[in-house]
């Protein structure tokens, strides 16, 4: 959580940013809050990317104002215009790219003041995993398969009734590159797994990190997966 | 009312170049949507080709991407795709669109069509 | 990219009735999915997006719900003018993609 303030003491206003993560190829949210004012057409909202010249958006006078918006994000960003009188300043970015990652500002003017606060975005890609059971092998062997991470990511292996134990000589796992030549489908096998028990598979790069778990007994599979991302950061 | 009308050959020979227009008529394609191109073979389901802002902004589908170009021309109120190398399987309806885009709400709908053209692709 | 299951290929329903149609997303597409109708030597006609928001002018007959990766197209009393084919369509991620289509038709 970063939260910023205006520098001229009563002139000043609270705005409150968190550091988020944008999964390539799909769209973004960039968020950003600040102190309400009473009326629409007394704020202003610009968005800044570090490194770029041009604005990423502006919206004055209860309107979206993008002359000076750069190239880069041309129709490709809003803001929730509904919900600015309520002191949302967050923006939506279509079809996030790697190259969206940076330092953004989100920088308010109202009636009360000024303020602004920084937003570390970064971009890659994550998604769930599944864990199924693999009929077609030799052996019982579990599959874990998610379809989309960028960068590549770790893969590791645990088991509920064997805590602690290390997994890496009896899994093996492999990246496979996505038509779009940037994201990897991951895919890990564990060999030799026991009934009765509980295994996951955890996979981790700098951005995110998923597991999918799956208890295998004599009647019946359960599965659940879980997504979180590491660095949602206030500030 | 928003209206789409494509124009274009409805007979393109294989190795050669499918050319298509869409004119946009009751609003003006510098507004806040993306245009989009979409693709319905004879009995089949749909598949995006490509989209483009009135900046020139585009994003293209994967599969298509190396032999699809889609162009704007504000003055005209029109843009247009070119479909390269095409194959009997490029044969298809060819739909123009516009995405929904309204502010608040996700891009990617499409909430106006043109009525469709057919392009063979045949010797 | 995602791929879009619909089921059944075909249903037939008689008029009056009630008729479900399912959408199912290879991967989580949370509630950016839109429902059209397209009816033969016609363009698709915009239902539902974000899963259950009504086009406008869409009858209240026509509801949608679902988030994630399964979705529902419910059409709750048939009339003769819903007899066409349906399709689903993700954009949570580009490339957008279709559902292959439902196609109701009468019983």
């Known amino acids: 959580l970063i939260i910023g303030f205006g520098i001229s003491g009563r002139h000043s206003i609270t705005v409150t940013t968190v550091a988020s993560a944008g999964n390539i190829g799909e769209d973004g949210i960039l968020s950003c809050t600040f102190e309400p004012d009473i009326k629409l057409s007394d704020i202003v909202i610009q968005w800044l990317k570090e490194g770029v010249l041009g604005l990423v958006h502006e919206f004055k006078e209860g309107k979206d104002e993008l002359s000076e918006q750069d190239e880069m994000f041309r129709g490709r960003t809003a803001v929730f215009a509904d919900q600015v009188i309520v002191g949302n300043a967050s923006l939506r970015l279509k079809n996030v790219q790697l190259t969206d990652a940076g330092t953004y500002k989100c920088y308010i003017i109202t009636s009360k003041g000024k303020g602004n606060a920084n937003l570390e975005y970064k971009t890659g890609a994550f998604s769930m995993p599944e864990v199924n059971v693999d009929y077609n092998a030799s052996s019982e062997t579990l599959r874990c398969e998610a379809p989309r991470w960028f960068p590549q990511p770790t893969v590791v292996w645990a088991s509920q009734v064997d805590q602690g134990a290390n997994f890496s000589e009896v899994s093996n796992t492999s990246f496979e590159l996505n038509s779009e030549n940037v994201t990897m489908k991951v895919v890990s096998v564990l060999y030799n797994v026991t009934i009765n028990n509980t295994y996951s598979c955890m996979i981790e790069n700098d951005i995110a990190k998923a597991t999918g778990d799956i208890k295998v007994t004599e009647s019946e599979i359960k599965r659940r997966s879980h997504l979180q991302l590491l660095n949602s950061k206030a500030s | 009312q928003v209206q789409l009308q494509e124009s274009g050959p409805g007979l393109v020979k294989p190795s050669g170049t499918l050319s298509l227009t869409c004119a946009v008529s009751g609003g003006s394609i510098s507004s806040s949507n993306w245009w989009s191109w979409v693709r319905q073979p004879p009995g089949k389901g749909l598949e995006a080709i490509g989209e483009i802002y009135h900046s020139g902004n585009t994003n293209y589908n994967p599969s298509l991407k190396s032999r699809v170009t889609i162009s704007v021309d504000k003055s005209k109120n029109q843009f247009s795709l070119k479909l390269s190398s095409v194959t009997a399987a490029d044969t298809a309806i060819y739909y123009c669109?516009?995405?929904?885009?309204?502010?608040?709400?996700?891009?990617?709908?499409?909430?106006?069509w043109g009525q469709g053209t057919l392009v063979t692709v045949s010797s | 990219e995602i791929v879009m299951t619909q089921s059944p290929a075909t249903l037939s329903v008689s008029p009056g009735e009630r008729a479900t149609l399912s959408c199912r997303a290879s991967?989580?597409?949370?509630?950016?999915l839109a429902w059209y109708q397209q009816k033969p030597g016609q363009a698709p006609w915009l239902l539902i997006y974000g899963a259950s928001t009504r086009a406008t002018g869409i009858p209240a007959r026509f509801s949608g719900s679902g988030s994630g990766t399964e979705f529902t197209l419910t059409i709750s009393s048939l009339q003769s003018e819903d007899f066409a084919v349906y399709y689903c369509?993700?954009?949570?991620?580009?490339?957008?993609?279709f559902g292959q289509g439902t196609k109701l038709e009468i019983k």
């Open positions: 991967q989580s597409v949370n509630s950016n």
């Open positions: 669109a516009r995405d929904g885009y309204s502010s608040g709400w996700y891009w990617g709908y499409f909430d106006y």
């Open positions: 369509q993700q954009y949570n991620h580009w490339p957008y993609t």
